[in-house]
């Protein structure tokens, strides 16, 4: 199972639910579906209040129980470590895969933390982070921001991922903007 890691803003915008949580238990495999669930302790919710309604406490995260079908395997044994989890809601349950954005909160830059906390949401409706994987690549629309981290640095952990967000400059136009300059 292979996938290109998304820009964190794309992960935020394309997810139904974005939370901060600790993985607190050993995964359990459901033999009817061959999905596994990890017990989590949610500490913050950044997106999904409306989607969840009253059931605003997520206690488990679900993923295929096999690597070959994009199951997520949690490798950290530190139960006090917080993770940013961006996933999809299916029948009221939080689902993730290998391709989901799951990262230790401490590994995120301050700018990314700010993005997840308040800024990425501003760009969700109008703007699109457009991955540039090979030269030449050009903007398809004024609302697109060319994401060149992988092209220039061979890593999704480049400058645009760690420090920038694609935000509206004016109607019909989005540009890369520094998350440092956003109000904290």
């Amino acid at each position: 199972c292979t996938c290109v890691p998304p820009h964190p803003q794309t992960a935020f915008c394309n997810s139904d639910l974005v939370i901060r949580a600790k993985f607190v238990g050993t995964p359990e495999v459901n033999q009817t579906t061959l999905y596994q669930r990890y017990e989590i302790k949610m500490t913050k919710m950044y997106k999904g209040f409306q989607a969840l309604g009253d059931a605003a406490d997520i206690r488990f995260v679900y993923t295929p129980a096999m690597e070959s079908v994009c199951g997520y395997f949690h490798r950290s044994h530190n139960r006090s470590e917080e993770f940013l989890i961006a996933g999809k809601l299916q029948d009221g349950l939080l689902h993730i895969t290998t391709c989901s954005f799951v990262a230790p909160w401490n590994s995120l830059s301050l700018a990314q933390r700010r993005g997840f906390t308040k800024t990425y949401t501003v760009g969700c409706e109008e703007c699109t982070v457009f991955p540039c994987l090979s030269i030449p690549c050009k903007l398809q629309s004024g609302t697109h921001c060319l994401w060149t981290d992988q092209l220039l640095q061979g890593s999704e952990k480049g400058f645009q991922s760690r420090h920038l967000a694609c935000l509206p400059r004016e109607p019909g136009l989005c540009t890369w903007q520094s998350l440092r300059s956003q109000i904290a």
Epitope: T26, T32, T33, L34
Partner: antibody
Framework: QVQLVESGGGLVQPGGSLRLSCAAS????????MSWVRQAPGKGLEWVSA????????YYADSVKGRFTISRDNSKNTLYLQMNSLRAEDTAVYYC??????WGQGTLVTVSS | DIALTQPASVSGSPGQSITISCTGT?????????VSWYQQHPGKAPKLMIY???NRPSGVSNRFSGSKSGNTASLTISGLQAEDEADYYC??????????FGGGTKLTVL
């Protein structure tokens, strides 16, 4: 109590086909993933294939991928293994297994000319 | 492919206790509580002795116990008896390949 009874084994020529069956009783069949495990003469155990309780997901060992097909009929509490393009190295006792625990008594498959 | 490592053989005298180890990785033994142990006498089908790391099916003697620490699971047989002489296999759920097995351990009761 849990009971798994395999059938369908026998002698088959290389390149031939066989269909194994496993009749299950003593538990809610549709709630459990089922798998086939084999043991070549004098050798250890090898997982062959698995299927989710609903039948929606199937998995295969690399050694049988493209040749074997696992399926189930939850209305009949029966698990199947369709084995095509059989090779000498497929000779083994084939066991049907419930989830990660109970096994049947096995059925012998011999591939020889 | 033998994914889990077991000693090829262990031995003990009647009445003694023996332990068989089963070492895997974080994606099998270490990652899940789905380790089973099977006893196999020559010419017979494997018999479930322990499931889910430490649970005994009904009918299995309480002389058999299972445990796990990190990536290693263990089967302990106390008060060894002649009929315990057999091959023992560990099995674990595995995130990469579904089920993995140890190579088997031949237990000899001296």
């Amino acid at each position: 109590q849990v009971q798994l009874v395999e059938s369908g084994g026998g002698l088959v020529q290389p390149g031939g086909s066989l269909r194994l069956s496993c009749a299950a009783s003593g538990f809610t069949f549709s709630s459990y993933a089922m798998s086939w495990v084999r043991q070549a003469p004098g050798k250890g155990l090898e997982w062959v294939s698995a299927i989710s309780g609903s039948g929606g997901s199937t998995y295969y060992a690399d050694s049988v991928k493209g040749r074997f097909t696992i399926s189930r009929d939850n209305s009949k509490n029966t698990l199947y293994l369709q084995m095509n393009s059989l090779r000498a190295e497929d000779t083994a006792v084939y066991y049907c297994a419930r989830g990660f625990d109970y096994w049947g008594q096995g059925t012998l498959v011999t591939v020889s000319s | 492919d033998i994914a889990l490592t077991q000693p090829a053989s262990v031995s003990g005298s009647p009445g003694q206790s023996i332990t068989i180890s089963c070492t895997g990785t974080s994606s099998d033994v270490g990652g899940y509580n789905y380790v089973s142990w099977y006893q196999q006498h020559p010419g017979k089908a494997p018999k479930l002795m322990i499931y889910d790391v430490s649970n005994r099916p009904s009918g299995v003697s309480n002389r058999f116990s299972g445990s796990k620490s990190g990536n290693t699971a263990s089967l302990t047989i106390s008060g060894l008896q002649a009929e315990d002489e057999a091959d023992y296999y560990c099995q674990s759920y595995d995130f990469k390949t579904y089920l993995v097995f140890g190579g088997g351990t031949k237990l000899t009761v001296l």
